[in-house]
């Protein structure tokens, strides 16, 4: 059962700027008199189905009105999602004998964009290089998790990584930042050798990766950094 009783709302993820459908299921074999959709307890739309002609749809919330649509089964479709669409939605299906309530919680998540790494590195006289790397994405919120990996091992569970690299005992080493939320992930790799190579003191550049529309395009090399984008 896709739609839920009011006690346990169905949690639905929407992506900022895209569309989402809140699925509605009808009571089997019963004639529906009307359907009311509510957003945060405020009326959104009132629908009167007809057997022989198109349903009457009264949109009662002008704010979301232009972005509202309904499927043949009166599921709610919301397009061009905004952060303020986050919240509680309810559909009440009224029949001759009963009223069925379906509840939803809509969460709007951002597609992650523009992953970048800032580097502050220091090369010591003993030839070891201390890397201080900071990873960020545009408009990050608490739902974005960051981690740093090298050779499949997690080196950090936060946007920052501090690591020492010794070219005499380590072969070329890539450090990869992975930023992830429920709807997308981005990764960006930097080379220790290129960051530390041949300079006594580095105040490194900022490396930026631009999202690749087609993930199959693979790597986008940007100086000493390269990145992946997944949806």
């Amino acid at each position: 059962d896709a739609s839920q009783s009011s006690l346990t709302p169905l949690m639905v993820n929407g992506i900022l700027g895209e569309s989402v459908t809140l699925p509605l299921e009808f009571p089997a074999g019963e004639k529906v008199n009307f359907i009311t959709w509510l957003f945060n307890e405020t009326s959104l739309a009132f629908i009167v189905p007809h057997e022989t002609k198109s349903p009457e749809i009264h949109v009662t919330n002008p704010k979301q009105g232009k972005r509202l649509n309904f499927t043949q089964s009166y599921s709610l479709q919301l397009s061009n999602l905004k952060m303020e669409d986050t919240g509680s939605y309810r559909a009440q299906i009224s029949t001759k004998t009963s009223a069925k309530l379906s509840s939803y919680t809509l969460r709007i998540l951002r597609q992650l964009r523009n992953i970048q790494v800032t580097n502050h590195s220091q090369l010591f006289q003993n030839m070891t290089c201390e890397l201080h790397l900071t990873c960020s994405v545009e408009d990050a919120d608490d739902n974005v998790s960051f981690r740093w990996e090298a050779l499949g091992n997690t080196l950090s569970s936060q946007p920052n990584l501090t690591v020492s690299w010794d070219p005499r005992i380590s072969s070329e080493q890539d450090y990869t930042c992975i930023a992830e939320n429920a709807v997308s992930n981005l990764s960006f790799s930097v080379s220790a050798q290129k960051l530390c190579g041949g300079r006594s003191s580095l105040e490194g550049p900022r490396f930026e990766g631009k999202p690749i529309p087609n993930p199959l395009l693979g790597l986008d090399s940007t100086r000493t950094g390269h990145h992946h984008h997944h949806h």
Epitope: M11, V12, N13, R107, D142, N143, S145, R147, W148, E149, T154, L155, S156, S157, Q158, P159, N160, L161, T162, V163, I178, E180, N181, A182
Partner: antibody
């Protein structure tokens, strides 16, 4: 090996303040965030939030905003949980847990039992 | 928040019996972010199965994990006395991070 050692059990009066410590060893402290988790018979395991051990920035779950404070002593590789204005319902076991990559609670402290009673 | 519903709440099993504990999520979860913890009485929880199906170090091969979307499970191929514990599922992709209420496994 990785170890998280917490301070011992505590008995406090309502209205008082308690500070629980979590001493980390066996890994680079500033590379892995530290979670705090509350466990009580009534509510089970509840994530309280975490602190970024690199820059000290805390993130609190909604239920734990205001009365609770996370802090660090980086040089001592120690994280702290402070609970102010103690209430009876704060009676619980509190755990620190090292954040992993996709695993949020890879290593746990042994827990600190806090009893709030007059 | 994402609610994780575990069932059963308590279960008594005989040695050698096959056990399945389920964890149902109120929102779909990427399999990389669903984990299981074991907690024995008087001890802290311990990471047991991570990323839905990977056994943590030292976990016996009689344990397995599976699932996707909103439905996940932990299975013990043949129950042993040392498996008596509480088992918790946990999701790590939505804030706040949440745990299931736990399944207490006892020996018959």
């Amino acid at each position: 090996q990785i170890q998280l050692v917490q301070s011992g059990p505590d008995l406090k009066n309502p209205g008082k303040t308690v500070k629980i410590s979590c001493k980390a060893s066996g890994y680079t402290f500033t590379n892995f965030g530290m979670n705090w988790v509350k466990q009580s018979p009534e509510r089970g395991l509840k994530w309280m939030g975490w602190i970024n051990t690199y820059n000290g920035k805390p993130t609190y779950a909604d239920d734990f905003k205001g009365q609770f404070a996370f802090s660090l002593e980086t040089s001592a590789t120690t994280a702290y949980l402070q609970i102010n204005n103690l209430k009876n319902e704060d009676t619980a076991a509190y755990f620190c847990a090292k954040r992993g990559g996709t695993v949020d609670f890879g290593y746990w402290g042994q827990g600190t039992t806090l009893t709030v009673s007059s | 928040e994402v609610v994780l519903t575990q069932s059963p709440t308590t279960m008594a099993a005989s040695p050698g019996e096959k056990i399945t504990v389920t964890c149902s999520a109120s929102s779909p979860i990427s399999s990389n972010f669903l984990h299981w913890y074991q907690q024995k009485p008087g001890f802290s929880p311990k990471l047991f199965i991570y990323r839905t199906s990977i056994l943590a170090s030292g976990v016996p091969a009689r344990f397995s994990g599976s699932g996707s979307g909103t439905s996940f499970s932990l299975t013990i191929g043949a129950m042993e006395a040392e498996d008596v514990a509480a088992y918790y599922c946990q999701q790590g992709i939505y804030m706040p991070l949440t745990f299931g209420a736990g399944t207490k496994l006892e020996l018959k």
